[in-house]
Amino acid sequence: KNLKSPQKVEVDIIDDNFILRWNRSDESVGNVTFSFDYQKTGMDNWIKLSGCQNITSTKCNFSSLKLNVYEEIKLRIRAEKENTSSWYEVDSFTPFRKAQIGPPEVHLEAEDKAIVIHISPGTKDSVMWALDGLSFTYSLVIWKNSSGVEERIENIYSRHKIYKLSPETTYCLKVKAALLTSWKIGVYSPVHCIKTTVENELPPPENIEVSVQNQNYVLKWDYTYANMTFQVQWLHAFLKRNPGNHLYKWKQIPDCENVKTTQCVFPQNVFQKGIYLLRVQASDGNNTSFWSEEIKFDTEIQAFLLPPVFNIRSLSDSFHIYIGAPKQSGNTPVIQDYPLIYEIIFWENTSNAERKIIEKKTDVTVPNLKPLTVYCVKARAHTMDEKLNKSSVFSDAVCEKTKPGNTSK
């Protein structure tokens, strides 16, 4: 009886794993083996495919073959018993184009209200992604084990920290890689779960802000308790994108080591031009907090984005606010050559209830005020460019009294 050629050959490539699967054409014939040949583009001769000769199953692995992953190849298969079937040719393909990104490796660390996720490619030193290793981005799905409500986080790098979680709670997540340059989305990792720790005695510092004063940077933060010491560290932001690096060598800011106030001042020349991450930690001598949320600090923008200056014209039921360019030391106005949006906060002097106005214009009306009442106003500028999502610190508050009634015109 003539042997029929195998049919429906599928090529699965995940990272550097090359797997072939096919269907037997004739299930009734026993003890059949299968063999593959391959042919590179521009070659006439066929070469035996190592790892895929005289196979008794319907699956074989040819990962050991050192192929140029960007070069098109052709495969053919036949069945063998006493005689052989005719060859069945598989459509030619380019391994790189066909390849899928495998599940990444995931490593989790827990804090009380945060989880640190370290992600690395599933295949170390992959040949398939050798030219693209630095271009991997990752996305993840995270959920509370008890609720199952999923949250997606896109475009993260090899280390990511998720904040604002609950203590003593199990969170589960899965991660997949993407190569946006090649329009490739990977396979999800297995699900990893970790339980956050008991709540730490000391919370981390919050609301870290950087401003510029004269030739110095001023770093301020909020803290719950008094009589603490703080340390501040920095890291080049680009290091977060380095997939092979899981040792982030955070460095101390010398003038911000063991400071006893919730701010520290250090010279601008501590940092060369660039984008940095900053973090703050608190200690009371016995206990240490976890690190604060990391803030991004761009020396270029920080140097320019100063708080706005403004004048107030007071009426009985409103303020007219005129925003001008901020002043540098020496009272020269700063030229801001990118669009800004202004956030104006105002409140009655005797109350803590703040109201907010966001405005693109430089003349702003604050309406619905009471006559003969002292109101305070502070303002800050934000860049409108999403990529440079920066904010100045707030200006000092300016307090003015509204006029008596009937002066609104």
């Epitope: 989790l108 660390e109 827990a110 009380d112 640190v116 720790t197 040792l247 060598k249 206990n287 240490t288």
Partner: antibody, heavy 118, light 107 residues
Framework: QVQLVQSGAEVKKPGASVKLSCKAS????????IHWVKQAPGQGLEWIGR????????KYAPKFQGRVTMTADTSISTAYMELSRLRSDDTVVYYC???????????WGQGTLVTVSS | DIQMTQSPSSLSASVGDRVTITCKTS??????VAWFQQKPGKAPKSLIY???YRYSGVPSRFSGSGSGTDFTLTISSLQPEDFATYYC?????????FGPGTKVDIK
């Protein structure tokens, strides 16, 4: 493969200094921290400090501050620890270890025995 | 400094026994805890990092668990080569510290 090879045993007099070396191979020393740990005979492990060989930034345990100096020569993949004003209780084995992010101290040197005796 | 205590300080066990060693830290260290094994006259050997991850080449009978201030090393079925001293280690904040050790010997 990854290896940390430490210098040989030393005998020193009280008050003297000793400089120990830890030669790394199989990895780039600049990508890691090198830690030093001491162990007295029959006792536990005690952390002395660490160096970042890339920029020579150090952290020392307060107990050793002022008496220990850690340095590194990346051109020969070697970290050093110098301990001054030696006392008889410095008669211990000193270990160097490689530290890499969440992997912590993953590889150790074989140890160097320092004997302080008059 | 973060203090670390280990219990028991020593234990006698037989081959095949399940052995559990606990480690307590004086403050919350997240999951920044590692475990080492040391045999007399030898350098420490790294077993576990980040509380529960085994280093490559470490047998699966070794496992770690815990978080915050309470950590555990478990040897599911003690083998003859496991008789040694075990140390926990925190690398959450400087100065890094070690537990005093737990000596596991043959019953």
């Amino acid at each position: 493969q990854v290896q940390l090879v430490q210098s040989g045993a030393e005998v020193k007099k009280p008050g003297a200094s000793v400089k120990l070396s830890c030669k790394a191979s199989g990895f780039n020393i600049k990508d890691y921290y090198i830690h030093w740990v001491k162990q007295a005979p029959g006792q536990g492990l005690e952390w002395i400090g660490r160096i970042d060989p890339e920029d020579a930034e150090t952290k020392y345990a307060p107990k050793f501050q002022g008496r220990v100096t850690m340095t590194a020569d990346t051109s020969i993949s070697t970290a050093y620890m110098e301990l001054s004003r030696l006392r008889s209780d410095d008669t211990v084995v000193y270990y160097c270890g490689r530290y890499h992010g969440y992997w912590a101290l993953d590889y150790w040197g074989q140890g160097t025995l320092v004997t302080v005796s008059s | 400094d973060i203090q670390m205590t280990q219990s028991p300080s020593s234990l006698s066990a037989s081959v095949g026994d399940r052995v559990t060693i606990t480690c307590k830290t004086s403050q919350n260290v997240g999951t920044n805890v590692a475990w080492f094994q040391q045999k007399p006259g030898k350098a420490p050997k790294s077993l576990i990092y980040s509380t529960s991850y085994r280093y490559s080449g470490v047998p699966s009978r070794f496992s770690g668990s815990g978080s915050g201030t309470d950590f555990t090393l478990t040897i599911s079925s003690l083998q003859p080569e496991d008789f040694a001293t075990y140390y926990c280690h925190q690398y959450f904040s400087y100065p890094y510290t070690f537990g005093p050790g737990t000596k596991v010997d043959i019953k």
